[in-house]
């Protein structure tokens, strides 16, 4: 439906509060450098200009489509080549082609401060000065350190926010009532971003047919009871929104997905019996939910999939009739049926099913040649299962710092031109896996695990991209995106690998080491173990283990010493020495 | 001159315990490790066990989870607490001090050593 304004017809659909919470979020997520008055002049430039557009669709400039708008908008700031250097010369272009350019200058890993947390009560002082303002913040340092922040769920993260300084600045207990609410709201968010960075990727750099496949597994495995064409449209529906999010395309976004939780409200007794309650929620909370709905009951009784993928006589028709249909009902019959299985999983089967059909379709007897394609889905099913239950095991008997430690070692013995930071936060992220999924029973431990490690090798690849050092990184994250975590699985140590040089200055502490949170502490510790693994690479298991017993021992002991500098100074040289005796560095 | 004395090695049935005690003198240890090392007939001398001043331990993998460090060091003293012993444990234990509270799960941060005492482990 061709609107005369497409500003205008967004402005209506979203209200003023959500489009312009909404610029806010693409700007600071395009010039993630400006400051936030900046983006705010900015934003209110282009509200004011699209009440105009609304008054009267046919002004001056309203026809204009919202890319060209925003970019000439975004063109306007002084500072752009002095702050952003090349990605200035994006306003040279003609749209499409700047709004392209200005995706390809998001950067996954800006050089912005760290967010310090300041005191409650001078929170819930600025929060109670200005609101409005106090709010807005939050949504600008999100969108500017996650580019590709899903922005609809943003703005359900920052109704959260509001909602707990409105409850907590009048507790009797600010922080006690403040410090948890944060704490998860910060949590969750860190997750939202990764798992929306690994759908922009997916459609990014794998296209449309990646991300579909994906949403075609995943929609089944929810939604067991609805049919194949219901699940098609979700799909078709699910994947334009996510386009237009990771497009920059946040207005349309927003409102198209209003309109698909409002679509799937309207038919949940086609869809799934678990979305009654997300159904009676308002339009964020509504649509969080449905995204976060927990599978609905398998229909009873459902036939083998041999019947129509194996035994039929029809299999090469089907399939030569029309392939993506056919494959997509093969994904969709086997995912409904597994709910025990990852995504990844799934797409794995389907893809060996699509290499099986090529080729014995093609065969003098097809029907000989793929009889036995099912056996060939063992292997695949067993190896991340086999990889679960040590993991867990390991994870069981370390606990989730040690076994964090482990990962640190093992990922820094595969990869360990990649920088130590990224490593860190990587291998971090990767040991929790074991307090995320390892709890649960194996019925749900796979697509727990599996699919939670394809959004953490996913900061990897593009932490990676931005900066290559690795070609073994490169080739696990561009080959396949459905075989990274197996990919990453199959590295062993890089043979080929010159240790770093030996330097003392890495391996030097301060006494502000003994003020620091007890995650910053473990980050310090975690990135002294990884720079031991790059300068000895071949050092054993129990070595380095030894050798992080000590340095906990000595951070410990000058922590509680009286001069705590003079202790890191004279102890750090005993206990670089020894190390470096025991590990002959 | 510093002295380290073990007791408590012998004959011991598989699954079954021992309990080694170390005894300083002649020096002060109270801020450096102390732990245990053992030799198998025909074998390179081994790790097995250390506990730092800050009470901080490292073990074997061999052992963990079956040995258990501990000191004394008001008495100057280190033990050696093994539980569940296989045939494999059978060696020459010795003692080990440190220079200092680091590198002493290897040869090369060891500054004395004790004599060592012989454990059997019979299945």
């Known amino acids: 439906d061709a609107h005369k304004s497409e500003v205008a017809h967004r402005f209506k659909d979203l209200g003023e509060e959500n489009f312009k919470a909404l610029v806010l979020i693409a700007f600071a997520q395009y010039l993630q450098q400006c400051p936030f008055e900046d983006h705010v002049k900015l934003v209110n430039e282009v509200t004011e200009f699209a009440k105009t557009c609304v008054a009267d669709e046919s002004a001056e400039n309203c026809d204009k489509s919202l890319h060209t708008l925003f970019g000439d908008k975004l063109c306007t700031v002084a500072t752009l080549r002095e702050t952003y250097g090349e990605m200035a010369d994006c306003c040279a272009k003609q749209e499409p082609e700047r709004n392209e350019c200005f995706l390809q200058h998001k950067d996954d890993n800006p050089n912005l401060p760290r967010l310090v947390r300041p005191e409650v009560d001078v929170m819930c002082t600025a929060f109670h000065d200005n609101e409005e303002t106090f709010l807005k913040k939050y949504l600008y340092e999100i969108a500017r350190r996650h580019p590709y922040f899903y922005a609809p769920e943003l703005l359900f993260f920052a109704k959260r926010y509001k909602a707990a300084f409105t409850e907590c600045c009048q507790a009797a207990d600010k922080a006690a009532c403040l410090l948890p609410k944060l704490d998860e709201l910060r949590d969750e968010g860190k997750a939202s971003s990764a798992k929306q960075r690994l759908k922009c990727a997916s459609l990014q750099k794998f296209g449309e047919r990646a991300f579909k496949a994906w949403a075609v597994a995943r929609l089944s495995q929810r939604f067991p009871k609805a049919e194949f064409a219901e699940v098609s449209k979700l799909v078709t529906d699910l994947t334009k929104v996510h386009t237009e999010c990771c497009h920059g395309d946040l207005l349309e976004c927003a409102d198209d997905r209003a309109d698909l939780a409002k679509y799937i409200c309207e038919n949940q007794d086609s869809i799934s019996s678990k979305l009654k309650e997300c159904c009676e929620k308002p339009l964020l909370e509504k649509s969080h939910c449905i995204a976060e709905v927990e599978n609905d009951e398998m229909p009873a009784d459902l036939p083998s999939l041999a019947a129509d993928f194996v035994e039929s006589k029809d299999v090469c028709k089907n399939y030569a009739e029309a392939k993506d249909v056919f494959l997509g009902m093969f994904l969709y019959e086997y995912a409904r049926r597994h709910p025990d299985y990852s995504v990844v999983l799934l797409l794995r089967l389907a893809k060996t099913y699509e290499t099986t059909l090529e080729k014995c379709c093609a065969a003098a007897d097809p029907h000989e040649c793929y009889a036995k394609v099912f056996d060939e889905f063992k292997p695949l099913v067993e190896e991340p299962q086999n990889l679960i239950k040590q993991n867990c095991e390991l994870f069981e008997q370390l606990g989730e710092y040690k076994f964090q430690n482990a990962l640190l070692v093992r990922y820094t013995k595969k990869v360990p031109q990649v920088s130590t930071p990224t490593l860190v936060e990587v291998s971090r992220n990767l040991g929790k896996v074991g307090s995320k999924c390892c709890k649960h029973p194996e019925a749900k431990r796979m697509p727990c695990a599996e699919d939670y490690l394809s959004v953490v090798l996913n900061q990897l690849c593009v932490l990676h991209e931005k900066t290559p050092v690795s070609d073994r990184v490169t080739k696990c994250c561009t080959e396949s995106l459905v075989n990274r975590r197996p990919c990453f699985s199959a590295l062993e140590v890089d043979e080929t690998y010159v240790p770093k040089e030996f330097n003392a200055e890495t391996f030097t502490f301060h006494a502000d080491i003994c003020t620091l949170s007890e995650k910053e502490r473990q980050i310090k510790k975690q990135t002294a173990l990884v720079e031991l693994v790059k300068h000895k690479p071949k050092a054993t298991k129990e070595q380095l283990k030894a050798v992080m017993d000590d340095f906990a021992a000595f951070v410990e002991k000058c922590c509680k010493a009286d001069d705590k500098e003079t202790c890191f100074a004279e102890e750090g040289k005993k206990l670089v020495a020894a190390s470096q005796a025991a590990l002959g560095l | 001159e510093v002295q380290l004395v073990e007791s408590g090695g012998g004959l011991a049935q598989a699954g079954g315990s021992l309990r080694l005690s170390c005894a300083a003198s002649?020096?002060?240890?109270?801020?450096?490790?102390m732990g245990w090392f053992r030799q198998a007939p025909g074998m390179e001398r081994e790790f097995v066990a250390i506990?730092?001043?800050?009470?901080?331990?490292t073990y074997a993998d061999s052992v963990e989870g079956r040995f258990t460090v501990s000191r004394d060091i008001a008495k100057n003293t280190v033990y050696l607490e093994m539980n569940s012993l296989k045939p494999e444990d059978t060696a020459v234990y010795s003692c080990?001090?440190?220079?200092?509270?680091?590198?002493?799960?290897?040869?090369?941060?060891?500054?004395?050593w004790g004599q060592g005492t012989q454990v059997t482990v019979s299945s």
């Open positions: 506990i730092r001043s800050t009470g901080h331990t």
């Open positions: 080990a001090a440190g220079a200092s509270d680091y590198g002493c799960y290897h040869t090369s941060g060891i500054s004395y």
């Open positions: 002649g020096g002060t240890f109270s801020n450096s490790c």
